[in-house]
């Protein structure tokens, strides 16, 4: 959570001379209360925007907009304090709009905007606009707060931002999963254009429980340049137990920009729906998961459909 670096912070508009200042989040009107204080903002609108820093990085920013109520209290409005709280870390950042001239009623509702709070992907923020001066201790509150959840790096708008690109958001591995004979699962994915290792993680669950019944990790060594954008294949030997059939596959890259904290892509292969016609007689504890058919699974179409629902984990 920070302010966009190089922009001149402007809040003046026709009919109002205004300056933006850094704030400690503790306006002195709390220490020296005033008798007459303005009412609260009428509406706050927050949306996501993308801005460039002076170093040319694209960063997600909050675009905050609010309007004033059309009452006489605007005659006592001396400014506003904008506060953004990042929920998970309790970090707070504030700026103050300081009005250098008195507000007057005009034909349109007064409207203010600010788009300089740089935020993180997949984080939740509380945005508060506090009109100044703040009210006396028992006075009616003159602030309004709204929450905003910044989308994760899967979101189209976020994908191109520098923090998301640094964690590998542009890489689409297009994972496919195929069940083979002899309790095997073949995972294929597209390599990115970097000579960096990958890890493929398989975790299997029973259909009815959340408990893992099998897991294994396979390493893929850093590809050579001529292998960039090619498909890589990994074959896993699965658990022998027929009930351990719900598979979760993750592909973890180790790109230089994010090391062991890169976005992972995952696919889930559900347990097959077993119909009476396809189930052979049980042998001991094991019912085959598939009928062999020239080296591919009866459920291959389902797997392929499933693989199109891949998603990021951060």
């Amino acid at each position: 959570l920070r302010l966009l670096d190089h922009r001149a912070l402007v809040c003046s508009q026709p009919g109002l001379n205004c300056t933006v200042k850094n704030s400690t989040c503790l306006d002195d009107s709390w220490i020296h209360p005033r008798n007459l204080t303005p009412s609260s903002p009428k509406n706050i609108y927050i949306n996501l925007s993308v801005s460039s820093t002076q170093h040319g990085e694209l960063v997600p920013v909050l675009h905050v907009e609010w309007t004033l109520q059309t009452d006489a209290s605007i005659l006592y409005l001396e400014g506003a304090e904008l506060s953004v709280l990042q929920l998970n870390t309790n970090e707070r950042l504030c700026v103050r709009f300081e009005f250098l001239s008195k507000l007057r009623h005009h034909h349109r509702r007064w409207r203010f905007t600010f788009s300089h709070f740089v935020v993180d992907p997949d984080q939740e923020y509380e945005v508060t606009v506090h009109h100044l001066p703040k009210p006396i201790p028992d006075g009616d509150p003159n602030h309004q707060s709204k929450n905003f959840l910044v989308p994760d790096c899967e979101h189209a708008r976020m994908k191109v931002t520098t923090p998301c690109m640094s964690s590998g958001s542009l890489w689409d591995p297009n994972i496919t999963v195929e069940t083979l004979e002899a309790h095997q699962l073949r995972v294929s994915f597209t390599l990115w254009n970097e000579s960096t290792p990958y890890q493929v993680l398989l975790e299997s669950f029973s259909d009815s429980e959340n408990h893992s019944c099998f897991d294994v990790v396979k390493q893929i060594f850093a590809p050579r340049q001529e292998e960039f954008h090619q498909r890589a294949n990994v074959t896993f030997t699965l658990s022998k137990f027929h009930w351990c059939c719900h598979h979760h596959v993750q592909v973890q890259p180790f790109f230089s920009s994010c090391l062991n904290d890169c976005l992972r892509h995952a696919v889930t292969v559900p347990c097959p729906v077993i119909s009476n016609t396809t189930v052979p007689k049980p042998v001991a504890d094991y019912i085959p998961l598939w009928e062999p058919r020239s080296g591919s699974s009866d459920y291959k179409d389902d797997d392929d459909k499933g693989s199109s629902h891949h998603h990021h984990h951060h």
Partner: antibody, heavy 118, light 107 residues
């Protein structure tokens, strides 16, 4: 001195209600999100709920969703947890905890004990 | 929701030993991880936040490392007063789940 003091615990029958309070002092309460965390006897810590400084963001653990309500009164420097439809498994020590700037929870109360039993 | 696991669930070590506790998240959580120490009958105390930053007042024999899904708490030289249960907690997004805990005692 930064301090959190919980109160309102006690014994209640299954299906009953209790309201826990947490009184904060020694810091600007209205600047902080606040959490409730609980610990069943002999068990580990379980995060229960969080409320942001201006109450615009509230989250609950799945185990209490729809039964517990977190709230706060910044003018009174107080945090609350209204617990309805209590179950045996809600028996625990309930702590209020303040998040640290940067992450984690650095200030905890001493806890208040809730016993749900018929 | 992201699951947190800890290993071992308990351990016994001698005074002066190096002790390592691991915490694993079922999905990546960047460095949004905290470690706590809880002594019997007491409230938890924050040891480490942001995966590796030592909380003020915590002895330097405690250290944290890791990012993404795998994290480690290390006590470089175990002391008698370190007998406690240690919990990790993820705080990237709600719910802010704790790990099941690791009980540490002296041999």
């Amino acid at each position: 001195e930064v301090q959190l003091v919980e109160s309102g615990g006690g014994s209640v029958q299954p299906g009953g209600s209790l309201r826990l309070s947490c009184a904060a002092s020694g810091f600007t309460f209205s600047s902080y999100s606040m959490n409730w965390v609980r610990q069943a006897p002999g068990k580990g810590l379980e995060w229960v709920s969080i409320i942001s400084s201006r109450s615009s963001i509230i989250h609950y653990a799945d185990s209490v969703k729809g039964r517990f309500t977190i709230s706060r009164d910044n003018a009174k420097n107080s945090l609350y947890l209204q617990m309805n439809s209590l179950r045996d498994e809600d028996t625990a020590v309930y702590y209020c905890a303040r998040p640290k700037v940067g992450g984690g929870m650095d200030v905890w109360g001493q806890g208040t004990t809730v016993t749900v039993s018929s | 929701d992201i699951q947190m696991t800890q290993s071992p669930s308990s351990l016994s070590a001698s005074v002066g030993d190096r002790v390592t506790i691991t915490c694993r998240a079922s999905q990546g959580i960047s460095n949004y991880l905290a470690w706590y120490q809880q002594k019997p009958g007491k409230f938890p105390e924050l040891l480490i936040y942001a995966a590796s930053t030592l909380q003020s007042g915590v002895p330097s024999r405690f250290s944290g490392s890791g990012s993404g899904t795998d994290f480690t708490l290390t006590i470089s030289s175990l002391q008698p007063e370190d007998v406690a249960t240690y919990y990790c907690q993820k705080y990237n997004r709600a719910p802010f789940t704790f790990g099941p805990g690791t009980k540490v005692d002296i041999k």
